[in-house]
């Protein structure tokens, strides 16, 4: 169940832990506090999951009923171009934006939005339902 | 590099419409929203409204009857538009690209006398 | 809406001197949110300060901003020329986002 790479997706997931949201195959958590991106990153890390990491424009719309107007960290940085945390790139948008501060990626109901790594927002882990599973 | 570059009229006739085009160059519409204020010399600095990377718009109570943002992401271009324009609405609109946690670079500005 | 006043409206100081300008909210702001701008005579405004305290890209250190709450301020330690500008202060942190009515800082 749920067994192939890091970044592979996980099939027929029973139930999320507490406090985590089942939607499809994975378990998302939504944060109540807010933390910098880095922290964000090894609050998910440290819980077996990974700041979420969006497949596809479905996923991201179905994602964003449940956002609100406040930003939320996912898994989206701007190293020469936006780039997901598992790799791939972030393709509808091509262009880099270059600015003189690190650009992480946020979410809200609104969609996609650049920010200052450093801002403190909520985030949104993503993982399988098995600690030990696929992270995407 | 970061730029946001504005066209449209300086000069609008009492009762008509404005409309101002800003076209981004260095960052992507998909991954920033876009801002508009104004500045007029009587009341400081407004801000109008936004559109969001993902199409959505907030305008401000103050002026959500009148105006209209829209975009096109793949000509990177911003659209504003705001109808029945009288003289307290002339000022100076800018069009300002977001990035968390503050409004970054700022267009040009685009000076609009309204007078007939 | 958040109302920011900032005060002076109006400032002059020599140069070498140390200026200090105030920004104050009718409700709390977050200093994640707070930012300053400065502008010139026929230039858009430019992030000067944001998040209370930090620099923008090529901004000289000797301007510092703090601040928490509802009160807040901008103050540069020693007045250069180039500093002479309107700074305004700024949230972002509730729509209708807010600007106050800035500080016109001159050389004396």
């Known amino acids: 169940l749920c067994q192939g790479s890091n970044y592979s997706t996980c099939a027929s997931c029973p139930s999320c832990p507490d406090r985590w949201m089942k939607y499809g195959n994975h378990c998302y958590y939504f944060s109540v506090e807010e933390k910098d991106w880095n922290s964000s990153l090894e609050f998910c890390l440290a819980r077996d999951s990974h700041l979420l990491v969006i497949t596809d424009n479905q996923e991201m719309s179905l994602l964003q009923v449940f956002l609100s107007e406040a930003f939320c960290w996912i898994g989206l940085r701007n190293n020469s171009g936006w780039r997901w945390e598992d790799g791939s790139p972030l393709n509808f948008s091509r262009i880099s934006s270059n600015s003189f501060v690190q650009t992480c990626g946020a979410i809200n109901k609104n969609g996609l939005q650049a920010s200052s790594c450093e801002v403190p927002l909520h985030w949104v882990c993503k993982k399988c339902p098995f600690a030990d599973q696929a992270l995407f | 590099q970061v730029q946001l570059k504005q066209s449209g009229p300086g000069l609008v006739q009492p009762s008509q419409s404005l409309s101002i085009t800003c076209t981004v160059s260095?960052?992507?519409?998909?991954?920033?929203?876009v801002h508009w204020v104004r500045q007029s010399p009587g009341k400081g600095l407004d801000w109008l409204g936004v559109?969001?990377?993902?199409?959505?718009?907030d305008y401000n109570a103050a002026f959500i009857s009148r105006l209209t943002i829209s975009k096109d992401n793949s000509k990177s271009q911003v659209f504003f538009k705001m109808n029945s324009l009288q003289a307290d609405d002339t000022a100076i609109y800018y069009c300002v690209r977001l990035l968390l946690p503050a409004m970054d670079y700022w267009g040009q500005g685009t000076s609009v006398t309204v007078s007939s | 809406q958040i109302v920011l006043t900032q005060s002076p409206a109006i400032m002059s100081a020599s140069l070498g001197e140390r200026v200090t300008m105030t920004c104050t909210a009718t409700s709390s702001v977050s200093s994640t949110y707070l930012h300053w701008y400065r502008q010139k005579p026929g230039s858009s405004p430019k992030l000067w300060i944001y998040s209370t305290s930090t620099l923008a890209s090529g901004v000289p250190v000797r301007f510092r901003g703090s601040g928490s709450g509802t009160s807040y301020s901008l103050t540069i330690s020693s007045m250069e020329a180039e500093d002479a500008a309107t700074y305004y202060c700024?949230?972002?942190?509730?729509?209708?986002?807010?600007f106050g009515g800035g500080t016109k800082l001159e050389i004396k």
């Open positions: 260095g960052f992507s519409l998909t991954t920033h929203a």
């Open positions: 700024h949230q972002y942190r509730r729509s209708p986002y807010t």
């Open positions: 559109i969001w990377s993902g199409g959505n718009t």
